[in-house]
């Protein structure tokens, strides 16, 4: 059946002619008010002159995704403004393919290739102009737009400088071969932010890595500030759709944040999976294992489909400060499997943190070193001391009786007591390593409901210092 689009346009299935009519290139000049006439068209040089297109400057193409509303959404205008503010001489072009995107999702997917071809033809034409270089082109695509950018990069004659995929769409792209989705082959540097990946239901964002570096903020799934309770506060009804939009669109806002909050850059750390990152294992910057996110991401050699992780705040600025904590729990008797709840408070030269929970990803290893990830929203400065609390309530009579019996048979230490001599801390952002020791080496034990204080006793862990992200990425 021949399907008609609103406004009488045919779908992309009817070929490039239809796409040509359905794709517009709106050149957003920062020179004065927005001019309606600044639409670029292959073969028409006048708009380039009229609207002061700078051939030697960076050129950004912003590509929206599938839309139910049929209108350009607010995020796009914010992104345009942020780019213009950060790169004052740059050209910013909005690829408007609304007539093809404002369809059933599946039909919009089937139009992505032909829209990508349309973008490639625009780039091919611009390459014929003096001073224009594909190396200066940065395609930024959100959701379906990320795959459009991929197709454009694939079809263009030459290699585009950079493609940023902002939560590339998942349905109909997950698991397909590289020629049918965004891939590292589509530009000299492809960086991707994944903010809505789900293993249950349908994953709106693609789960698989599709770039040179693939960054998964907060594990790529539950974004802070996007829970049903959070969206309930801002709308009449907190619905799943609001959560989906919040989490999917978070990729855009993280990118905008990287443009406007230059003084608060966020860093991501290479890791094989989210669980290992949650354990605090992956906070290294050696061998390019950390990178800036969003606009501040840097191309590193020989990286492809590299997964990177970070935690973020619930809103702008999104930056947090990551710390790896290594704690060796000594247990003087067999206490079986215990599941303690520990909290830490970090005290620094600038501020003290909130009470932070130590997330136990698997199980506490007794008589073993356990690694934890904690993060703070504020810059604490140089760490001075740490308070560790073992959450616990007053025990039942049965617990007390068991403890008393245990004491009779082994009158040394109560059951469910652990000993901790030191805490080793590494800052993700500065890569500094510090060791914190108990004040009195004789008083190292902690039981439920108790706290233990640790004071900085050594710079480093008696290990070679690593480079910090600020040094590496400057």
């Amino acid at each position: 059946a021949e399907e008609q689009l609103e406004g009488g346009l045919r779908t992309a299935k009817d070929g490039p002619a239809a796409a040509k009519a359905a794709v517009r290139f709106h050149f957003r000049t920062s020179k004065g008010p927005e001019r309606e006439g600044c639409y670029l068209s292959v073969g028409h040089s006048q708009p380039l002159e009229d609207c002061s297109f700078n051939m030697t400057a960076k050129t950004f193409f912003i590509i929206h995704g599938w839309t139910m509303s049929g209108m350009l959404e607010n995020w796009l205008h914010k992104l345009v403004s942020a780019l213009q503010m950060r790169e004052k001489d740059a050209n910013v072009v909005v690829v408007d393919w609304l007539p093809l995107a404002h369809q059933l999702y599946t039909d919009a997917v089937n139009s992505t290739r032909v829209v990508g071809l349309s973008v490639a033809k625009m780039l091919d034409w611009l390459q014929g102009k003096d001073g224009f270089s594909l190396g200066n082109v940065h395609l930024i695509g959100y959701s379906l737009g990320a795959h459009v950018a991929g197709f454009a990069g694939n079809f263009v004659k030459g290699t585009v400088g950079r493609i940023t995929g902002l939560d590339p769409a998942g349905p109909m792209f997950e698991g397909v071969d590289i020629h049918r989705r965004l891939s590292p082959d589509d530009a000299d540097f492809v960086d991707v932010l994944h903010t809505y990946t789900r293993s249950f239901g349908i994953s709106i964002g693609i789960q698989m890595p599709v770039g040179h570096i693939d960054i998964y903020p907060n594990g790529g799934d539950f974004q802070p500030g996007c829970g049903l309770n959070d969206v309930l506060g801002s709308i009449a009804y907190g619905t799943i759709a609001e959560v989906v939009k919040c989490e999917h669109e978070r990729a855009v806002h993280l990118f905008v944040d990287s443009l406007v909050n230059q003084d608060k850059p966020s860093f991501a750390f290479q890791c094989t999976d989210s669980n290992r990152f949650k354990k605090g294992i992956c906070l290294s910057c050696r061998k390019n294992r950390c990178n800036g996110i969003g606009y501040n991401a840097k191309k590193t050699r020989n990286k492809r489909n590299t997964k990177m992780y970070l935690k973020t705040r619930a809103g702008m600025p999104f930056r947090v400060y990551h710390y790896q904590m290594k704690i060796h729990f000594f247990s003087y008797k067999s206490v079986g499997a215990i599941e303690p709840t520990f909290y830490v408070t970090l005290y620094g030269t600038n501020a003290e943190s909130q009470v932070l929970s130590l997330e136990i990803v698997e199980q506490i290893g007794l008589n073993a070193t356990n690694t934890f990830l904690v993060y703070t929203e504020e810059d604490l400065g140089d760490l001075l001391k740490i308070k560790l609390t073992w959450e616990g309530t007053s025990r039942s009579w049965y617990d007390l009786w068991r403890e008393f019996r245990s004491y009779l048979s082994q009158p040394h230490r109560p059951e469910r007591e652990l000993s901790i001599r030191r805490i080793r801390v590494k800052s993700g952002e500065t890569q500094r390593r510090l060791t914190f020791c108990v004040e009195d080496p004789e008083k190292t034990s902690i039981a439920p409901g108790q706290e233990l204080w640790f004071y900085k006793c050594r710079d480093g862990w008696r290990m070679k210092n690593e480079t910090s992200p600020t040094v590496e990425l400057s």
């Epitope: 399907e3 609103e6 509303s69 059933l104 349905p171 109909m172 349908i202 009804y237 609001e242 989906v244």
Partner: antibody, heavy 119, light 107 residues
Framework: QVQLQQSGAELVKPGASVRLSCKAS????????IHWVKQRSGQGLEWIGW????????KYNEKFKDKATLTADKSSRTVYMELSRLTSEDSAVYFC????????????WGQGTLVTVSA | DIQMTQTTSSLSASLGDRVTISCRAS??????LNWYQQQPDGTVKLLIY???RLHSGVPSRFSGSGSGTDYSLTISNLEQEDIATYFC?????????FGGGTNLEIK
């Protein structure tokens, strides 16, 4: 919780028109598309079209584009379907249902409105 | 338009049985296949979306599978409340189309 409340049964004469309503509650009305589906007695389901209150966007099944007209009143959170030039072929139960984006499924359905066309 | 075919229009089974209902599309629908249950009182409910994803509140005895053009719905342990008519629907392209339905009865 999400609810779609449809208007009551209608007995109409051939050649006349009828307007069915579907009142939505329990979610942000402008965020979801409402679809209409026809079921003739003892038969299968036929998709009529959709209405998206967020931008008044409408899509029709080619088969129904001269039969059905979809509109909405945002203030009352209600979507309407008007059926014109009724014949006995239009005698059926008409359902409204809410579209789930990306999955292209109809997650919540109204209880249905029976339309009987008879002289 | 994409044709959806449910070859079995009626099916008898005993309580506790494992029941499978099939559905075929006239072309590849990329897993955009949904299953609905219509109860005897006419109430329609979504059971499975996107081939295999269970809609919230649907018992885990319902499951879906398939790819390309062939899909199926399985009820692992038939209960009395499952007696109903089951429809498949493709959401791959407009117009959306439904299968003719499979009426499930007790033996």
């Amino acid at each position: 919780q999400v609810q779609l409340q449809q208007s009551g049964a209608e007995l109409v004469k051939p050649g006349a028109s009828v307007r069915l309503s579907c009142k939505a509650s329990g979610y942000t009305f402008t965020k979801y598309t409402i679809h209409w589906v026809k079921q003739r007695s003892g038969q299968g389901l036929e998709w009529i079209g959709w209405f998206y209150p967020g931008s008044d966007s409408i899509k029709y099944n080619e088969k129904f584009k001269d039969k059905a007209t979809l509109t909405a009143d945002k203030s009352s959170r209600t979507v309407y379907m008007e059926l014109s030039r009724l014949t006995s072929e239009d005698s059926a139960v008409y359902f409204c249902a809410r579209h789930e984006e990306y999955t292209n499924s109809l997650a919540y359905w109204g209880q249905g409105t029976l339309v009987t066309v008879s002289a | 338009d994409i044709q959806m075919t449910q070859t079995t229009s009626s099916l008898s089974a005993s309580l506790g049985d494992r029941v499978t209902i099939s559905c075929r599309a006239s072309q590849d629908i990329s897993n955009y296949l949904n299953w609905y249950q219509q109860q005897p009182d006419g109430t329609v409910k979504l059971l499975i979306y996107y081939t295999s994803r269970l809609h919230s509140g649907v018992p885990s005895r319902f499951s879906g599978s398939g790819s390309g053009t062939d899909y199926s719905l399985t009820i692992s342990n038939l209960e009395q409340e499952d007696i109903a008519t089951y429809f498949c629907q493709q959401g791959y392209t407009l117009p959306w189309t439904f299968g003719g339905g499979t009426n499930l009865e007790i033996k």
